[in-house]
């Protein structure tokens, strides 16, 4: 439905508070280096303009598109060329090319300082002094570091952030109350950002059809009692929401997400029996709750899939009449029966089924040709099952830190050209699959593990895309979205890699390591491990373990020494020499 003024329409739908927050997020995700104060000024100007349009939709410029209004505003930033270089060229373009240009310049790994958490009293004072600015700053700092963060969900995080400070800044022990809440928000935020990044990559790199297939599979698992027509409607609406958010249309996205939550709750009888509690919550909590809701129980007496998709005489007729609808039905029927499968596995099965029908429906005897198609699924199902079993056994044997180290070695040998910080970050996250998923019973392990690995490997893909260094990574990332994990799993040691020159500086440590948190200390050690493998890719597990054990003992010893810096200097030299000898460097 057309509105005379799009900006007035969205302002009225969302309300001033959400409107301002979403515009701030949008601007911070586009201009990631701009100071906070500059963004706040731009947002205030846009908000004042929106109010004039609410008062009179026929006022000057009120009929302009949001992209035109926001793009014009961003292009007024004085330091655009100095700060962003070629991104300033976007401003010479017309819409919609200008917005596409801004999108292409979003940086998944912006050169921004790490967020350091101030003392609790300092944070509480800042919160009490100016709550509005404090919360805006949170939105700004998260949005600029995570340019694809799902904007309506970031509003939910900000609401929880505010609640944490409101409660804890008046608690007897502020730190004990606040810090665990902030840690939880940080970890959940990183996970949420990575999940959304995969959705955007799916849409932008593989297209709407790929995203819709993912959504059909996931929603069919979650809402197995819903009819195919209902699932199809939800998929269409959800695709619109994510297309908008990934495209920078945050006001439309938030508005449409609210409409979708409303529709789901009004029709929960024909969607899922698990929605009742979610639907009693306020909007932001409701939308979050629906997105995380547990799978409903499967309907009674579902017939064998073979009846419709193998034994029926009409398989090729049904396929020819509407290929994507028939494949959608196959995916829906398979997924609702298999909450125990990962979404990516279900998509591989659907792709195999599609390939078989393409071949067989052109054959002399189609039924004879596709009669055994379900037999082809067996190895596809067993491969992730076996991989998860082996890796969970390894995780239970080693614990998280050493399991991460095993993955660091494995992935550095596969793709040694990738930067050390990226290998450390990605392998640490891959290693978290153990504590996240191995505790689950068999029926929940695969959807937990393989779909999580898809999210983590997408981080590798988007970071690598910024500065491509490995043809193998590019190949695994671009050939097939659903086969990324099997592609990386299948990679062996890269025999073409020329080992990195040894640099003693890389293995020189100082007393500052002693004051680091356990996590930071682990990262230092894991960085050294990656560098070791890059110098000596043929080193055995035993050799690497011996060197890492010596390294851990060296850090422990020097951190206990009276003169720590001297210890690190002298013992460090000895350790480097011993390690070189042990590895034959």
């Amino acid at each position: 439905d057309a509105h005379k003024s799009e900006v007035a329409h969205r302002f009225k739908d969302l309300g001033e508070e959400n409107f301002k927050a979403l515009v701030l997020i949008a601007f911070a995700q586009y201009l990631q280096q701009c100071p906070f104060e500059d963004h706040v000024k731009l947002v205030n100007e846009v908000t004042e303009f929106a109010k004039t349009c609410v008062a009179d939709e026929s006022a000057e410029n009120c009929d302009k598109s949001l992209h035109t209004l926001f793009g014009d505003k961003l292009c007024t930033v004085a330091t655009l060329r100095e700060t962003y270089g070629e991104m300033a060229d976007c401003c010479a373009k017309q819409e919609p090319e200008r917005n596409e240009c801004f999108l292409q310049h979003k940086d998944d790994n912006p050169n921004l300082p790490r967020l350091v958490r101030p003392e609790v009293d300092v944070m509480c004072t800042a919160f009490h002094d100016n709550e509005e600015t404090f919360l805006k700053k949170y939105l700004y700092e998260i949005a600029r570091r995570h340019p694809y963060f799902y904007a309506p969900e970031l509003l939910f995080f900000a609401k929880r952030y505010k609640a944490a400070f409101t409660e804890c800044c008046q608690a007897a022990d502020k730190a004990a109350c606040l810090l665990p809440k902030l840690d939880e928000l940080r970890d959940e935020g990183k996970a949420s950002s990575a999940k959304q990044r995969l959705k955007c990559a799916s849409l932008q790199k593989f297209g709407e059809r790929a995203f819709k297939a993912w959504a059909v599979a996931r929603l069919s698992q979650r809402f197995p009692k819903a009819e195919f027509a209902e699932v199809s409607k939800l998929v269409t609406d959800l695709t619109k929401v994510h297309t908008e958010c990934c495209h920078g249309d945050l006001l439309e996205c938030a508005d449409d997400r609210a409409d979708l939550a409303k529709y789901i709750c009004e029709n929960q009888d024909s969607i899922s029996s698990k929605l009742k509690e979610c639907c009693e919550k306020p909007l932001l909590e409701k939308s979050h709750c629906i997105a995380e809701v547990e799978n409903d129980e499967m309907p009674a007496d579902l017939p064998s899939l073979a009846a419709d998709f193998v034994e029926s005489k009409d398989v090729c007729k049904n396929y020819a009449e509407a290929k994507d609808v028939f494949l959608g039905m196959f995916l829906y029927e398979y997924a609702r029966r298999h909450p125990d499968y990962s979404v990516v596995l279900l998509l591989r099965l659907a792709k195999t089924y599609e390939t078989t029908l393409e071949k067989c429906c052109a054959a002399a005897d189609p039924h004879e040709c596709y009669a055994k198609v379900f037999d082809e699924f067996k190895p596809l199902v067993e491969e992730p099952q076996n991989l998860i079993k082996q890796n969970c056994e390894l995780f239970e044997q080693l614990g998280e830190y050493k399991f991460q180290n095993a993955l660091l070695v494995r992935y550095t040998k596969k793709v040694p050209q990738v930067s050390t910080p990226t290998l450390v970050e990605v392998s640490r996250n891959l290693g978290k699959v153990g504590s996240k998923c191995c505790k689950h019973p068999e029926a929940k392990r695969m959807p937990c593990a393989e779909d999580y690995l898809s999210v983590v490997l997408n981080q590798l893909c988007v970071l690598h895309e910024k500065t491509p260094v490995s043809d193998r990574v590019t190949k695994c990332c671009t050939e097939s979205l659903v086969n990324r994990r099997p592609c990386f799993s299948a990679l062996e040691v890269d025999e073409t890699y020329v080992p990195k020159e040894f640099n003693a500086e890389t293995f020189t440590f100082h007393a500052d390591i002693c004051t680091l948190s356990e996590k930071e200390r682990q990262i230092k050690k894991q960085t050294a491990l990656v560098e070791l493998v890059k110098h000596k890719p043929k080193a055995t597990k035993e050799q690497l373990k011996a060197v890492m054990d010596d390294f851990a003992a060296f850090v422990e010893k020097c951190c206990k020494a009276d003169d720590k810096e001297t210890c690190f200097a002298e013992e460090g030299k000895k350790l480097v020499a011993a390690s070189q000898a042990a590895l034959g460097l």
Epitope: K225, E227, S270, P299, A300, P303, A307, D308, D314
Partner: nanobody
Framework: EVQLQESGGGLVEPGGSLRLSCVAS????????MSWVRQAPGKGLEWVSS????????SYADSVKGRFTMSRDNAKNTLYLQLNSLKSEDTAMYYC???????????LGQGTLVTVSS
């Protein structure tokens, strides 16, 4: 607006046969599993059978298994129920409804009455 128009009922002797039809309109017929339910005089609704979207997969209540056969023609937006070896306890108003094995009450059409009596 969703419309389901049942027909084909009538008076039949025990052991006899009938074929019920249901013509659907106002929605994308082939995107829904469909079911037949019935209501005997003075009783509640009882599920009879269901059929998948494509039409190959079916499920039947124990009381009608082996006697009733459900089918659909998506090109004609029509659902069928073939009733064989009818018994007096099959006497009921028969309704077609959207959905597989519906466990939530759904709007019912006018139905078609099957009476089995000698």
């Amino acid at each position: 607006e969703v419309q389901l128009q049942e027909s084909g009922g009538g008076l039949v002797e025990p052991g006899g046969s009938l074929r019920l039809s249901c013509v659907a309109s106002g929605f994308t017929f082939q995107h829904y599993a469909m079911s037949w339910v019935r209501q005997a005089p003075g009783k509640g609704l009882e599920w009879v059978s269901s059929i998948s979207t494509v039409g190959g997969g079916t499920s039947y209540a124990d009381s009608v298994k082996g006697r009733f056969t459900m089918s659909r023609d998506n090109a004609k937006n029509t659902l069928y129920l073939q009733l064989n070896s009818l018994k007096s306890e099959d006497t009921a108003m028969y309704y077609c409804v959207r959905g597989w094995h519906p466990d939530v009450p759904r709007p019912l059409g006018q139905g078609t009455l099957v009476t089995v009596s000698s």
